[in-house]
């Protein structure tokens, strides 16, 4: 058996004297009782302890013997009051009581801190009958004590609806300090003070705390638990832990990393998800956040065509969802696109630039200076125009679409002609005489058909009339562009 240097209740012989009204020799079997199961407890304590005042409940028996002598009051015998032992050791303690034989069916229950102990606990009750009384010994054993076994244990017995309660047996399990609060990892601003907390408990108390930074002790003198370490500020990452010391030894907390917040790393993998004539949808993979959450991102768009100005457009967006649609771009243009993101410390560098192109769109303006005139000799209508400015073509011109509507009494028909992009004139056959021809022209790219020009009207006379002058797109302010020849 293992004995402790600090036992408050010294181990007594298991049964130092005979039970009242019986002879020691009558009870020789009791000497082997604790070992009947083969279990060797680390500490064994006597159910009686002479000279110690009795504080348990007492039951006064109402029944008298043949000689009519009143029976002595029933009470648990004095026992050891306080057991101190180390974690993982075994312990056995017991309650004993002598009960007159007139009482039947007596049972003893064990309670800890006010709650009955049921089930899995190792409790054994042994009965030793004699002529007048039965000695009852209730043993409670724990093979490997843990901190959770700390507490006040009592025995209870019910007789005549009366409850007899033993004195408490206090079990104190001592061990290495146990952390109730350990330092937590933190992300801190450079050169800014912060606190770390460490708390550990026994028993035994007191528990003293030493702080460790990057394997070196911070405080020369220990602090009583709980301890708060104020770090005035760091310039680089550090690992902190705390040591908790008590009489049993020391326990070291987990090491926690204290990171210094920094600007984020630049985003990576900027990629083009989709392109239209005037917008580009991009996505990116955020870089390392610098130990501080991203707040927002900036998309920088730079004209990249060989002779473009290089104008820079900046679009701000939220950090999530790493996706942005860049709008208001020119069609069929090249752009360099970069992404930068920020946290509370500042902006990251710009991601590697990627080249992106918008697609062709339909022209945004109509052909200019549309002129229409009648060539009576060939019975044709000649149409001339100027192509839209390059920047507003929004793509490579593939041709023009000409709408000509012929209206005379009771007749109206629209015809569409497609002409190639080379040249800026077309000739259409007269469809109806003595009618008005209304001409409109739209430029066409692979991106689609642009807007039609303002209508230009010309009157086609009956055969034999003279061809005088052309009709053309009106100057601003002219209400009606009809010219009757």
């Amino acid at each position: 058996a293992i004995t402790e240097a600090r036992e408050e209740a010294k181990p007594y012989p298991l049964f130092p004297g005979p039970f009242p009204g019986s002879l020691q020799t009558d009870h020789t079997p009791l000497l082997s009782l604790p070992h009947a199961s083969g279990y060797q407890p680390a500490l064994m304590f006597s159910p009686t302890q002479p000279g110690r005042p009795h504080t348990g409940n007492v039951a006064i028996p109402q029944v008298t013997s043949v000689e009519s002598k009143p029976l002595p009051p029933l009470a648990f015998k004095h026992t050891v009051g306080h057991i101190i032992l180390s974690e993982h050791k075994g312990v056995k303690f017991n309650c004993s009581i002598s009960v007159p034989n007139i009482y039947q069916d007596t049972t003893i229950s064990w309670w800890k801190d006010g709650k009955e102990l049921l089930g899995a606990h190792h409790a054994i009750t042994q009965f030793y009958p004699d002529d007048e009384v039965t000695a009852i010994i209730a043993s409670f054993s724990i093979t490997s004590v843990q901190r959770s076994d700390n507490g006040s244990y009592i025995c209870k017995m019910k007789i005549n609806n009366e409850e007899i309660v033993s004195d408490p047996i206090y079990i104190e399990v001592q061990g290495l300090p146990h952390f109730t609060k350990q330092p937590e990892s933190m992300n801190v601003t450079r050169n800014t003070a912060f606190n770390l907390t460490c708390q550990a408990v026994g028993p035994p108390e007191p528990v003293n705390i030493f702080w460790v930074q990057n394997s070196s002790r911070v405080n020369e003198q220990p602090e009583k638990s709980p301890s708060v370490l104020t770090v005035p500020g760091l310039t680089e990452m550090a690992v902190f832990s705390c040591e908790a010391h008590n009489d049993k030894g020391l326990t070291v907390s987990k090491g926690v990393q204290i990171n210094i917040k920094a600007i984020p790393s630049p985003p990576t993998e900027v990629s083009i998800r989709n392109s239209t004539a005037h917008s580009i949808l991009i996505s990116w993979v955020p870089g390392f956040d610098g130990y501080s959450p991203f707040r927002n991102c900036s998309i920088q768009v730079k004209e990249a065509d060989p002779l473009s100005n290089g104008s820079v457009m900046i679009f701000n967006t939220s950090a999530l969802p790493h996706l942005y649609q860049i709008k208001q771009l020119q069609a069929l243009a090249n752009y360099s696109i970069g992404v930068s993101c920020m946290n509370e410390i500042g902006w990251s560098a710009v991601s590697p630039w990627i080249l992106a192109s918008t697609t062709e769109g339909a022209p945004s303006v109509a052909p200019l200076n549309v002129t229409v005139f009648l060539n009576e000799s060939s019975d044709n209508v000649d149409i001339r125009w100027m192509k839209p400015p390059t920047k507003q073509q929004d793509g490579e011109l593939v041709g023009y679409r000409i709408s000509h509507v012929w209206q005379s009494a009771g007749i109206s028909k629209e015809l569409l002609e497609e002409v190639g992009q080379n040249g800026s004139r077309a000739r259409i056959s007269v469809q109806v005489h003595n009618a008005t021809c209304t001409v409109r022209i739209a430029a066409v790219t692979r991106g689609g058909v642009g807007p039609f020009s303002d209508p230009v009207k010309i009157f086609i006379p009956a055969h034999g009339w003279v061809d005088y002058a052309p009709s053309s797109t009106p100057a601003p302010g002219n209400a009606d562009p009809v010219l009757i020849i």
Epitope: S308, W353, K391
Partner: antibody, heavy 117, light 107 residues
């Protein structure tokens, strides 16, 4: 009013280096590409490369790789072109140019670099 | 790299005459051709930019046409003040490349 100021001339010895400057004013320096063009006396024009002051992105003519290095100083709105290991072939007028609306609209007055022993 | 072949190298015309300069490119550049005028001791000046667009303030006697690989620059009614070197510049792709130039003189 957009202006690109260049020193009129630089005289350098063969094998040496020269750093030609171009101070920009009258516009947002970081918002436009800056191009450099070479013109040998009585000859045509050659495009050397361009740099964007916003982020110092450069596009170089392979012919001038290792010969010309383009840099900018945003604080003074100045673009620089360093020419190294100079030979008589490098004697020329060097222009800084910025494009606007699809053409080389603004030119510096040019710096005549003469390589002579 | 797109090479630009400009012709003629020089020409001499009387005032009032028409001048035609041609540039041919080795790749299809769409309409990304520019035309520059350079007078002695001065930097070049842009006359016509991409898409045959006449620059603001440039007299209408200057014009250009062409698409793809063949481009023509024209001066109608040449004046004595038009004496200069003329260059074409393709701006479709990098590196930018210039024509070798045409020296215009007045007879």
């Amino acid at each position: 009013q957009v202006q690109l100021q260049q020193p009129g001339a630089e005289l350098v010895k063969p094998g040496a280096s020269v750093k030609v400057s171009c101070k920009a004013s009258g516009y947002t320096f970081t918002n436009y590409w800056m191009h450099w063009v070479k013109q040998r006396p009585g000859q045509g024009l050659e495009w050397i490369g361009r740099i964007h002051p916003f982020d110092t992105e450069t596009n170089d003519n392979q012919k001038f790789k290792g010969k010309a290095t383009l840099t900018v100083d945003k604080s003074s709105s100045t673009a620089y072109m360093q020419l190294s290991s100079l030979t008589s072939e490098d004697s020329a007028v060097y222009y800084c140019v910025i494009p606007a609306n699809g053409g080389f609209a603004y030119w510096g007055q040019g710096t005549l670099v003469t390589v002579s022993a | 790299e797109t090479t630009v072949t400009q012709s003629p190298a020089s020409l001499s015309v009387a005032t009032g005459e028409k001048v035609t300069i041609r540039c041919i490119t080795s790749t299809d550049i769409g309409d990304d051709m520019n035309w520059y005028q350079q007078k002695p001791g001065e930097p070049p000046k842009v006359l016509i930019s991409e898409g045959n667009s006449l620059r603001p303030g440039v007299p209408s006697r200057f014009s250009s046409s062409g698409y793809g690989t063949d481009f023509v620059f024209t001066i109608e009614n040449t004046l004595s003040e038009d004496v200069a070197d003329y260059f074409c510049l393709q701006s479709d792709n990098l590196p930018l490349t210039f024509g070798s130039g045409t020296k215009l003189e007045i007879k």
